[in-house]
């Protein structure tokens, strides 16, 4: 197993509908043509395996688990969207990247992007 | 509806090995969010570990992270918790339990519908 860099923003606001997206960039030591991208949340004494994509350069990403993420890439960049937040969902959220195929294996694990999320205030009841 | 029946537990020595297993029976168990939680006599249950509903993500609490290991069967409606450099203090009695889902990241605060009887596992110093 070799080591490799993963760069990620450190800190990312969800939006107002529970969507944060950041970018997972990886310094690609030779031409992987299988990468496996997964998204770990600690926080809460938790490590969480959030979701998880395995996918072919030039491909889409494709999560399993009805996942609450969606991403593309484009060469050592993965653009990831995590949707369905809510407060509770405030952690750290660390991209870790294998390159699978060939080998030899690299491990790469970023030093996480801190999401805060913040749930929208009820609207007030209009008088209307 | 979903039955849960765990097995495995018993009385260790500090540093042992142990595999508990959780076998299901009803309901579409690969559907359901699967998780393991622990609770001593007089103390609040606590989450150990859960497992998404194919099997490829997991979470761990952080005091058993790199120790214990969970995983899943769907085909035989089983759910496994490897435990391993036991120590005196993972002394508990062991539920295994079901939720709908989906995953989420929290799996520990998503309602568990459906608990088993518990395992005690004993660690002697």
């Known amino acids: 197993c070799k080591a490799m860099h993963v760069a990620q923003p450190a800190v990312v606001l969800a939006s107002s509908r529970g969507i944060a997206s950041f970018v997972c960039e990886y310094a690609s030591p030779g031409k992987a043509t299988e990468v496996r991208v997964t998204v770990l949340r600690q926080a809460d004494s938790q490590v969480t395996e959030v979701c998880a994509a395995t996918y072919m350069m030039g491909n889409e990403l494709t999560f399993l688990d009805d996942s609450i993420c969606t991403g593309t890439s484009s060469g050592n960049q993965v653009n990831l969207t995590i949707q369905g937040l809510r407060a509770m969902d405030t952690g750290l959220y660390i991209c870790k990247v294998e390159l699978m195929y060939p080998p030899p294996y690299y491990l790469g694990i970023g030093n996480g992007t801190q999401i805060y999320v913040i749930d929208p205030e009820p609207c007030p009841d209009s008088d209307f | 509806e979903v039955q849960l029946v765990e097995s495995g537990g018993g009385l260790v020595q500090a540093g042992d090995s142990l595999t508990l297993s959780c076998a299901a029976s009803?309901?579409?168990?690969?559907?359901?969010?699967m998780g393991w939680f622990r609770q001593a006599s007089g103390k609040e249950r606590e989450f150990v570990a859960a497992i998404s509903p194919s099997g490829t993500l997991t979470s761990y609490a952080d005091s058993v992270k790199g120790r214990f290991g969970i995983s899943r069967d769907n085909a035989k409606k089983m759910v496994y918790l490897q435990v391993s450099s036991l120590k005196p203090e993972d002394t508990d009695v062991y539920y295994c339990a079901a939720a709908r889902g989906p995953w989420t990241p929290r799996p520990s605060l998503l309602t568990y519908d459906y608990w088993g009887q518990g395992t005690q596992v004993t660690v002697s110093s």
């Open positions: 009803g309901g579409t168990f690969s559907t359901y969010v």
